[in-house]
């Protein structure tokens, strides 16, 4: 016979030779990193035919890590369903709480033993300092020194010394979320009041109200005669602007050699101005919606 | 609190020309939107138009052609150019600090008389 | 223009007497309407703005109700002080417009 088989987890006793007598016996033993469990043959003989009888490394199994607990409020996943080396071992924490300590163990070979390579993380329930306290406003809940994992908190604004009032800019309710901070940052609380939107030869449509706050929101239309150049819809903003700004109402005029500018309501920029009546967004000659202003 | 003080009126002849002056004291005019209004027996209260903090203009468009709105800085004082005046233009002047950005009209000067005759 | 009209042109009232003035707009202008009170040789004073709010100062006999072309200016309780004239005033669309004035004078 020829050199005896090969295997992963076993190794010849022995140094091979090139060929073997009929009837010659060869023994194998389970290599570092694995233990033998009886009763399959860890042997075999040369056949009368030159070939080896059948023999099996089946019977070297791996050597095992010891079994890890799942740690308290968390999960041990093993990655490949077994505790022999090379495995992984990772874990998770439930939700309210964070690792402290490695995220995956691997088990390893010291020697001729399997151990992890580090100790078992670490739940610890997630916990918040108080959140910002802000100018001009407060949060719920102010009085609490520790805050638990979703534990949520609501900021208002105080009254305004003047007459007009703070409006909060951001989240007004944030939470203890993950890794112990806060799911929003602090909002502020501050006047935001944009300036009464004037719109010569147009008119507000919508949003009317006695001051313009943060959030405002207001529609404007051109009169007869006029198209937009800008947005219809404009929004107060944190620093007390209107965004986009105010539109402009420019005169609708029918030389076909003056370009037009560009309108929020128009597609492609048109070669010329067409007449009123075919604008976009305008009125055919008949149809007097744009004479009265509040129909 | 800003005082609004006008200046600048008298007489003067049909087809002339005539610039009021409205100085604040006591605040910068550049920190303020700046309106003018007239006031006549026949024609009542009228609105001629408005300079904003950042230099921008609106006018009544009867009065566009003839009336300019201006301001000078250096000088804290905003202005109202006339020309071409007629006689329906005899009225009181005044320049009117316009309420925090809103077309309220909450702080008004003493006002000035232009009287346009031949 | 949008156009403003008052009634009555003038009234003779009372010390004491409940007096309301109207104003009416030719077009829809929502709640955009200011109230001036003015006295002889002197500057209008701002009353009322946004058709019901009080000017710092105004006395809280004065209010304003309405909204979209018809408007009142109401005085409670008429006092000496108030004998003068009244205007209203649109905001919602250039050129801002007055109303010609109500004349209050003591009965």
């Known amino acids: 016979c020829e050199a005896p088989p090969t295997f992963e987890a076993m190794e010849l006793i022995g140094k091979p030779k090139p060929y073997y007598r009929v009837g010659e016996r060869v023994d194998y033993k389970c290599k570092k990193g694995y233990f033998y469990i009886p009763p399959l043959a860890t042997h075999t003989i040369c056949d009368r035919n030159h070939t080896w009888l059948p023999v099996s490394d089946e019977g070297c199994y791996r050597e095992m890590c010891p079994h890890i607990r799942d740690p308290l409020n968390g999960e041990a996943i093993l990655a490949n369903g077994s505790y022999e080396f090379g495995a992984e071992l990772h874990f998770i924490c439930n939700e309210g709480y964070y690792l402290i300590g490695k995220d995956i163990l691997y088990c390893e070979l010291k020697d001729t033993v399997a151990i992890w390579s580090g100790k078992p993380p670490l739940c610890e329930k997630i916990l918040c300092t108080p959140p910002p306290k802000i100018k001009n406003g407060k949060h719920t809940f102010s009085e609490v020194e520790v805050f638990e994992y979703l534990d949520a908190v609501t900021y208002s604004c105080d009254p305004a010394p003047g007459p007009d009032p703070f409006s909060l800019i951001g989240e007004s309710m944030i939470y203890c979320g993950n890794n112990s901070t806060w799911s929003h940052a602090a909002p502020e609380c501050k006047v935001v009041k944009c300036r009464f939107p004037v719109v010569e030869n147009g008119k507000q449509i919508s949003g009317f109200g006695k001051k313009f706050y943060y959030k405002a929101t207001v529609m404007f239309e051109c009169d007869k005669g006029y198209y937009l150049n800008g947005s219809d819809k404009i929004v107060c903003e944190s620093n007390s602007t209107w965004d986009p700004p105010v539109p402009k109402c420019l005169k609708v005029s029918t030389s076909p050699t003056t370009k037009s500018p560009t309108s929020s309501a128009s597609g492609p920029r048109p070669t010329y101005k067409p007449p009123v009546s075919n604008y976009p967004g305008y009125p055919k000659p008949d149809e007097g919606i744009l004479n009265n202003l509040d129909d | 609190e800003v005082q609004l003080v006008e200046s600048g009126g008298g007489l003067v002849q049909p087809g002339g020309s005539l610039r009021l002056s409205c100085a604040a004291s006591g605040g910068s005019v550049s920190s303020y939107d700046i309106s003018w209004i007239r006031q006549s027996p026949s024609r009542g209260l009228e609105w001629l138009g408005v300079?904003?903090?950042?230099?921008?203009?609106n006018y009544n468009s009867a009065f566009m052609s003839r009336f300019t709105i201006s301001r000078d800085d250096s000088k804290n004082t905003a202005y109202l150019q006339m020309n071409s005046l007629k006689t329906e233009d005899t009225a009181v002047y005044y320049c009117e600090r316009v309420y925090d950005g809103y077309p309220w009209f909450a702080y008004w000067g003493q006002g000035t008389l232009v009287t346009v005759s031949s | 223009a949008i156009q403003l009209t008052q009634s009555p042109s003038s009234l003779s009232a009372s010390v004491g007497d409940r007096v309301t003035i109207t104003c009416r707009a030719l077009q829809g202008i929502s709640n955009y309407l200011n109230w001036y009170q003015q006295k002889p040789g002197k500057a209008p004073k701002l009353l009322i703005y946004y058709t019901s709010s009080l000017h710092s100062g105004v006395p809280s006999r004065f209010s304003g109700s309405g909204s979209g072309t018809e408007f009142t200016l109401t005085i409670s309780s008429l006092q000496p002080d108030d004998f003068a004239t009244y205007y209203c005033?649109?905001?919602?669309?250039?050129?801002?417009?007055f109303g010609q004035g109500t004349k209050v004078e003591i009965k």
């Open positions: 005033q649109q905001y919602i669309k250039l050129p801002w417009t």
């Open positions: 300079i904003w903090t950042d230099g921008g203009t």
